[in-house]
Amino acid sequence: TTELTEEKYEYKEGQTLEVKCDYALEKYANSRKAWQKMEGKMPKILAKTERPSENSHPVQVGRITLEDYPDHGLLQVRMTNLQVEDSGLYQCVIYQHPKESHVLFNPICLVVTKGSSGTPGSSENSTQNVYRTPSTTAKALGPRYTSPRTVTQAPPESTVVVSTPGSEINLTNVTDIIRVPVFN
């Protein structure tokens, strides 16, 4: 069985989000992929790849870069210079038609907060890359890590309902801590 779990990524303004979405090679290698933000009940397509996809041929739309690796079945998404208003729920989709998109796994809940009162613009080029989750719980490990080096997920009771045309997906969160390297 496949679990649909939402990952929560927390960033400071100016940092860069880098995530990936995997897909079935045999089905979608030549399909267009898109990165969308859920706004109310309707998703908003922010960027989409060309068709047919070409290896290592990035598509840039403003602060968003998509790079499809059809040989590997992976789409890389990069969002630079994050702003508070970028906060929200995002997902990768196989873009077939504006009203007909197949949602890929691992929806992303992005939370962007104002940077700490440091040197203006000091975090502009920094990247937070979610690394991995320790096997211990957030409660036990939390105090050892300070923002922005930790990402904690919402409590297990919370469920986000994502509505996409013709489908409804329940995404259940898991409580954990994710360590991240912070690049300046």
């Epitope: 496949t2 990952e7 690796y69 079945g73 796994f105 989750t133 994710i178 390297p181």
Partner: antibody
């Protein structure tokens, strides 16, 4: 504790196939990618490909495409890597390694299996 | 594919010496670089990820620096247990590629 345990050494003939297993324990199996890396005797490390145990999707490096198959059994938290049409130059130690969480573009392999020696000889 | 060139391929140093290994990428890889240690007959061990973030439990004598195409891995004071081969690995673009390795020995 978090660990990956691989199946034992294999000796096989050219043209045959080998299937190596990698059992994960101590963490949420479906949240992290599993990667396969091989190392010929006295040589460096070579990435073969990845698998997302949750979606079941996988991908491999061009040179292995068509010869490598990655599968998983979530009920026993095990990933399998099968390499077919074996040649003598496939003789190597094959490692499974845990990558980052599946949604992250972060490919650091923090947990490794002990390795499985595969010898291809006629 | 991105080529990772490590140098030197081997080195010999005394206990307490400062050891430096370099890794050069054939194109800009941002900070997308990891360092591993592999002892004979064992699986590799992650030491540094994201160019300079030390993995939990790894001694502070190990450090990493650099960005773009040029990276450095340093052992500030070589210990007998550091005898191993060290590898860099890039993850900026697929396929993931490793450097050829640097074998560190004690004089």
């Amino acid at each position: 504790q978090v660990q990956l345990v691989q199946s034992g050494a294999e000796v096989t003939k050219p043209g045959a196939s080998v299937k190596v297993s990698c059992k994960a324990s101590g963490y949420t199996f479906t949240r992290y990618d599993i990667n396969w890396v091989r190392q010929a005797t006295g040589q460096g490390l070579e990435w073969m490909g990845w698998m997302n145990p949750n979606s079941g999707n996988s991908g491999s490096v061009q040179k292995f495409r068509g010869r490598v198959t990655m599968t998983r059994d979530t009920s026993i938290t095990t990933v399998y890597m099968e390499l077919s049409s074996l040649r003598s130059d496939d003789t190597a130690v094959y490692y499974c390694a845990r990558g980052g969480i599946s949604s992250s573009w972060h490919w650091a392999f923090d947990i490794w299996g002990q390795g499985t020696m595969v010898t291809v000889s006629s | 594919d991105i080529q990772m060139t490590q140098s030197p391929s081997s080195l010999s140093a005394s206990v307490g010496d400062r050891v430096t290994i370099t890794c050069q990428a054939s194109q800009d890889i941002n900070n997308h670089l990891n360092w591993y240690q592999q002892k004979p007959g064992k699986a590799p061990k992650l030491l540094i990820y994201g160019a300079y973030t030390l993995e939990t439990g790894v001694p502070s004598r190990f450090s990493g620096s650099g960005s773009g195409t040029d990276f450095t891995f340093t052992i500030s004071s070589l210990q007998p247990e550091d005898i191993a081969t060290y590898y860099c690995q890039q993850y900026d673009k697929l396929p993931l590629t490793f450097g050829g390795g640097t074998k560190v020995e004690i004089k």
